[in-house]
């Protein structure tokens, strides 16, 4: 589809006369009629197959022909045609003289034509005109012509339809040729996919409009290349959606149990060294000089007693020092200058001779040690309480003093909180990581449901026949004041009355 | 060849969200070259189209009944649905999808038999 | 809103031309489609990309689309081409369809 237009520019007939040398009276009043059809070697009447148009009275003999695409489109005249353009044709300009105002060609006597021209060839469709000028021996016609397609036809031969879009069956305009030209954004065949914005993940993500990243589910972050793990993952991640694959030290379905309390607390002080023992569980092995279940007491070198045979210990910045009793002497009063004419062994201690009487040693009694049974058996000087245990010495044997929420001879073992059945009046326990909590039942309150809140016992209107209820408080139970003509706890029995 | 078949409840009450599913065959919902509509026939009365889902999950929708309309699309079992939410008696209709061709402009070059939808206490 | 102006009928007699004509502000850079209802039946498409015909329509349709204006023609209209007829274009994303036609062929 597309329009033949032909531009008229000039007209000549000085002599103002008909094509048949007779003058026009009082002026050839000239106007045009155009025939535009098929290639014709040799152009002959017939049928205009590619389309007629006329124009009004243009001027009188001679005349330039203004442009005028204003007025009803007269020139460039337009010939349109609704097919493919064949590249060639013929065209046949009359001019005509119109002595009145009837323009018909029935309403004209056949000698008013001035001229006919004829021209064939070959013709391309563009925006560029070709110029031609027409003599004959009165006249001159000059004028120019092209083809050019209809709106939103395109190509060679203006065959191609093609209408710019911009909605989602695509966001194009067309090219010259027809073929269309994606707006800025979009691809595809028809310009309807956009161009997600650039690392976009091909798989997880997409986009309906472009330079955006909508992530498909299961999949986040700004390229929809970060999966989701399963919802409440704490110390976990995942390689595809909706896993929680642990992180070390980690543990259970949400990856939130603390298998390493080691590393994530340090709760061991003083340089000791942690053992992982389960989970959130840990053991503190302390170096020498320190004590406690986090290693976080100090020993004084002289608690382990270094100093033997009753010699006393000094602390001293760099360690001890022992004042040795007469008769001993060495780095811990190891050394005995005494015999067993000396009576060295107390606590009831026997003496024997050694080295034929250089040397001696005491046979301590139960309870009693030291190279002179001067000391109390310590049986604490190990340390055996574990998880911050008191170690105390009972005789001739030792006990461990646990710590709140543990049990056991060395206070190994870790006892619930609900055990000593704390919660008052019936509460019920439930342990706490870091305590416990009571569940109270109705009438009581507080931490341990030990404060007693009143209940209104008469909430429940147990008295009948209108009797009034009154709350002890004391006991909360109801007392019902009945009215005349009825007893019982509730008033609800009736006496007969006289 | 082609086919589209509507299935869904053929009464919904005043106020209920009306739910039709669109199950393809013969054809794969994810191409690229369609996207998948659905459009209404009051009896006696026009087409209205309601709106239209790309495999990809991109929808549009009727502006006037934008608020009330979700589609959406299951690439896995090959069928993309409608629900109209707080429906009334206007709602009642017979309601087709069909499959609207890029190549051919948008045209609906494939329709469902279309199943009625009366709307009623 | 956009909207398509059809004639509610249109009445012709069997071997003649129908023309059935569809009206939308600027519809000639729109592509309008053409569909066919017969009663209880789907439609079907018989035009679309304004004068394009999908395989299995007749000749006898054809279409235009310039200006405001957009036409179904069908030549050598025949009895069983009674039916409704509905224009259709896309204004942005939305769908757009004409109210009908009714042809009668006497």
């Known amino acids: 589809s597309g329009v033949f237009q032909l531009q008229l520019q000039e007209f000549i007939n000085e002599r103002g006369v008909l094509a048949s040398g007779r003058p026009c009276e009082p002026g050839c009043r000239t106007f045009f009629r155009v025939c535009l059809k098929h290639f014709q070697a040799v152009v002959s009447p017939g049928p205009c197959t590619f389309g007629t148009v006329s124009t009004p009275v243009l001027g009188t003999n001679s005349f330039a022909v203004r442009d005028d695409s204003s007025g009803g489109g007269r020139n460039p005249l337009q010939l349109p045609f609704n097919f493919t353009w064949p590249g060639t044709f013929s065209l046949i300009i009359e001019a005509w003289h119109a002595p009145g105002d009837d323009l018909r060609p029935e309403a004209l006597p056949p000698d008013a034509l001035i001229s006919k021209i004829a021209i064939q060839g070959s013709l391309a469709v563009g925006q560029n005109w070709l110029l031609d000028e027409q003599t004959s021996t009165l006249t001159r016609l000059r004028y120019s012509y092209r083809v050019i397609c209809s709106d939103n036809y395109y190509g060679d031969n203006c065959s191609r339809l093609c209408k710019k879009r911009n909605d989602h069956f695509g966001h194009y305009v067309c090219q010259p040729d027809g073929n269309l030209s994606c707006l800025p954004g979009w691809t595809g065949e028809y310009c309807q996919q956009p161009i997600c914005l650039s690392g976009c993940h091909e798989q997880n993500g997409y986009c309906s409009k472009p330079a955006e990243c909508l992530c498909r589910p299961g999949w986040q972050g700004r390229l929809c290349n970060e999966c989701i793990p399963h919802n409440g993952c704490r110390h976990g991640t995942c390689s595809t959606p909706w896993q929680c694959t642990c992180d070390e030290g980690w543990g259970g379905l949400f990856c939130d149990q603390d298998l390493n309390y080691c590393t994530h607390h340090s709760p061991c002080k003083n340089g000791a060294t942690c053992s992982n023992s389960g989970q959130r569980s840990y053991t503190c092995t302390c170096r020498p000089g320190y004590t406690g279940v986090d290693c976080e007491l100090e020993l004084s070198e002289c608690d382990s007693n270094p100093c033997r045979n009753g010699g006393s210990c000094k602390d001293q910045e760099d360690g001890y020092h022992c004042l040795c009793p007469p008769g001993y002497y060495g780095l811990h009063c190891e050394h005995s200058t005494l015999s067993c004419a000396d009576s060295p062994c107390f606590n009831g201690g026997s003496c024997r001779e050694r080295n034929q009487g250089a040397n001696y040693a005491c046979e301590c009694p139960p309870n009693f040690t030291g190279s002179n049974c001067e000391k109390k058996v310590d049986r604490c000087t190990s340390n055996p309480c574990a998880n911050g245990g008191q170690c105390l010495n009972r005789g001739p044997s030792r006990m461990c003093r646990c710590r709140p929420g543990f049990t056991g001879t060395y206070c190994e073992l870790h006892v619930s909180d609900c055990a000593r059945n704390p919660c008052a009046h019936g509460g019920t326990c439930h342990d706490l990581e870091n305590g416990l909590m009571c569940t109270c039942p109705a009438g009581f309150s507080g931490r341990r449901c030990e404060v007693r809140t009143s209940i209104d016992a008469c909430a429940s209107s147990p008295c009948f026949n209108r009797a009034t209820c009154y709350t002890d408080l004391s006991t909360d139970t109801f007392v019902c004041n009945c009215p005349y003509g009825f007893v019982g706890s509730r008033c609800e029995f009736p006496v007969g009355l006289p | 060849e082609v086919q589209l078949q509507e299935s869904g409840p053929g009464l919904v009450k005043p106020s209920e969200t009306l739910s039709l599913t669109c199950t393809v065959s013969?054809?794969?919902?994810?191409?690229?070259?369609?996207?998948w509509g659905w459009i209404r026939q009051p009896p006696g009365k026009g087409l209205e189209w309601i709106g239209d889902?790309?495999?990809?999950?991109?929808?549009y929708y009727n502006p006037s009944l934008k608020s009330r309309v979700t589609i959406s699309v299951d690439t896995s079992k090959n069928q993309f649905s409608l629900k109209l939410s707080s429906v009334t008696a206007a709602d009642t209709a017979v309601y087709y999808c069909?499959?609207?061709?890029?190549?051919?402009?948008?045209?609906?070059?494939?329709w469902g038999q279309g199943t009625l939808v009366t709307v009623s206490s | 809103s956009y909207e398509l102006t059809q004639p509610p009928s249109v009445s012709v007699s069997p071997g003649q031309t129908a023309s059935i004509t569809c009206s939308g502000q600027?519809?000639?850079?729109?592509?309008a489609s053409w569909y066919q209802q017969k009663p209880g039946q789907s439609p079907v498409l018989v035009i679309y990309?304004?004068?394009k015909r999908p395989s299995g329509i007749p000749e006898r349709f054809s279409g235009s689309n310039s200006g405001d204006t957009a036409t179904l023609t069908i030549s050598g209209t025949q009895p069983m081409d009674e039916a409704d007829y509905y224009c259709?274009?896309?204004?942005?994303?939305?769908?757009?369809f004409g109210g009908g036609t009714k042809l009668t062929v006497l």
């Open positions: 990309e304004d004068s």
């Open positions: 013969g054809g794969s919902i994810s191409s690229s070259s369609y996207y």
């Open positions: 259709q274009a896309w204004d942005r994303d939305t769908g757009v």
């Open positions: 069909a499959r609207q061709a890029l190549a051919m402009g948008g045209g609906s070059d494939k």
């Open positions: 889902i790309y495999y990809t999950g991109s929808t």
């Open positions: 600027r519809l000639g850079d729109k592509y």
